[in-house]
């Protein structure tokens, strides 16, 4: 079954770090980039960056540089999204989005990973 | 970065009647060379994630009813369910992917 | 409509490096893909790698990794294809092409298909 | 990487007729993907198709493309002289691989 997992819901403290796991079943992973898109409660859906997941290279949008680091595990269909400098503001669903090479939009989602920042 | 702006907020519409929502980019989403419009538009229920409906702004994702269908051009993009059904209750999305990704911020749907 | 113009042939040592320039004019140097293809004598067409200026790196085909470099240069649409530890076998014509693959996951810019084409440029490679 | 294998590696053929090019991927290539290009002796390859059956702007349409998966055709109805050329095909996936080529001749 093609699918995406991910892992299960977070709580955090304000300044620390959380990594959301996304594993993949189904397909092969290489032919596909990997993004992660959060929303905040009652909010609109907020892109983070991408994967290539064949070749590991990264693009992230430029509100999130230097606090989001996505990475892959091809041996494990697992891609990753590490945050650090937890603030409230990034309670959130957290998404993997599927994108195929040169098509551009996302046709398999995982079902989120809601993560809470409190003190 | 681009910005997409959806209207309306809201929608209020009675079942089997037309809905209609609109999405307006501040840059041009057609690229030239390839001919196509890099704009999708999502659906998204209480609780679950997204789902694809429509690329390339008119093309219909394989599964989708086709009383969803997308059109448009540039700058101005539109979302139709001709004819509302109970499960289209949600809140549906526009996304562009001309440059990076942005979303608009939501249209919900609900029936009057 | 644009237009792809190279640098002159050149004629270098084996071990020494080569450096061939492709001038666009036309269009939106920055948001277009820019490719380098060469083509030994008598043989087929060969992918070297590819550059979308408005990102800045660029991506190479696994034959040509840590010896090809391709830059661009924004302020005078120009793009660069620098060849080091040249061989005999890499004697060929060179040319820059408009199209790359997309490594950049964003439909805006440019997609795949190579054209135009610069004129080419021949680099012999003999000592 | 992938291979494009085209066939035949020589077509000898009169103006007029028609000529039939191959291209094999040795795996599926999304038709979006897939070009044809023309050579000259001592000039630049010149765009044909694009996405596997897209006529790029200025090409006779005497030239067509067509095919999906792993096998594409390149047909030329009716030759002109300015036709004989080599013609290659190429995969602009994520990394681009062209063919051999395949040239056509007077018979």
């Known amino acids: 079954q093609v699918q995406l997992v991910q892992s299960g819901a977070e709580v955090k403290k304000p300044g620390a770090s959380v990594k959301v796991s996304c594993k993949a079943s189904g397909f092969n992973i290489k032919d596909y980039y990997m993004h992660w898109v959060r929303q905040a409660p009652g909010q609109r859906l907020e892109w983070m960056g991408w994967i290539d997941l064949e070749n590991a290279n990264t693009i992230y949008d430029a509100k999130f540089q230097g606090r989001v680091t996505i990475t892959r595990d091809t041996s494990a269909s697992t891609a990753y999204m590490e945050l650090s400098s937890l603030r409230s503001e990034d309670t959130a669903v957290y998404y993997c989005a599927r994108d195929v090479y040169g098509r551009y939009f996302y046709d398999l989602w995982g079902q989120g990973t809601l993560v809470t920042v409190s003190s | 970065d681009i910005v997409m702006t959806q209207s309306p907020d809201s929608l209020a519409v009675s079942l089997g009647e037309r809905a209609t929502i609109n999405c307006k980019s501040s840059q041009s989403l057609l690229n030239a060379r390839t001919g196509k419009n890099y704009l999708a538009w999502y659906q998204q229920k209480p609780g679950q994630p997204p789902k694809l409906l429509i690329y390339w702004a008119s093309t219909r994702e394989s599964g989708v009813p086709d009383r969803f269908s997308g059109s448009g051009s540039g700058t101005d993009f539109t979302l139709t369910i001709s004819s509302l059904q109970a499960e289209d209750v949600a809140v549906y999305y526009c996304k562009q992917s001309y440059s990076r990704r942005t979303f608009g911020g939501g249209t919900k749907v609900e029936i009057k | 409509q644009v237009q792809l113009v190279q640098s002159g042939a050149e004629v270098k040592k084996p071990g020494s490096s080569v450096k061939v320039s492709c001038k666009a004019s036309?269009?939106?140097?920055?948001?277009?893909?820019i490719s380098w293809v060469r083509q030994a004598p008598g043989q087929g067409l060969e992918w070297m790698g590819g550059i979308i200026p408005i990102f800045g790196t660029a991506n190479y085909a696994q034959k040509f990794q840590g010896r090809v470099t391709i830059t661009a240069d924004e302020s005078t649409s120009t793009a660069y294809m620098e060849l080091s530890s040249l061989r005999s076998e890499d004697t060929a014509v060179y040319y820059c092409a408009r199209g790359a693959p997309n490594y950049y996951g964003s439909g805006g810019y440019d997609d795949g298909w190579f054209d135009p084409w610069g004129q080419g440029t021949l680099v012999t490679v003999s000592s | 990487e992938i291979v494009m294998t085209q066939s035949p590696g020589t077509l000898s053929l009169s103006p007029g007729e028609r000529a039939t090019l191959s291209c094999r991927a040795s795996q599926s290539v999304s038709s979006s993907y897939l070009a044809w290009y023309q050579q000259k002796p001592g000039q630049a390859p010149r765009l044909l198709i694009y996405?596997?059956?897209s006529r790029a702007t200025g090409i006779p349409d005497r030239f067509s493309g067509s095919g999906s998966g792993t096998d594409f055709t390149l047909t030329i109805s009716r030759l002109e002289p300015e036709d004989f050329a080599v013609y290659y095909c190429?995969?602009?996936?994520?990394?681009?691989?062209f063919g051999g080529g395949t040239k056509v001749e007077i018979k």
């Open positions: 190429q995969q602009f996936g994520r990394y681009p691989t």
């Open positions: 036309g269009g939106t140097f920055s948001s277009y893909a």
């Open positions: 996405g596997a059956s």
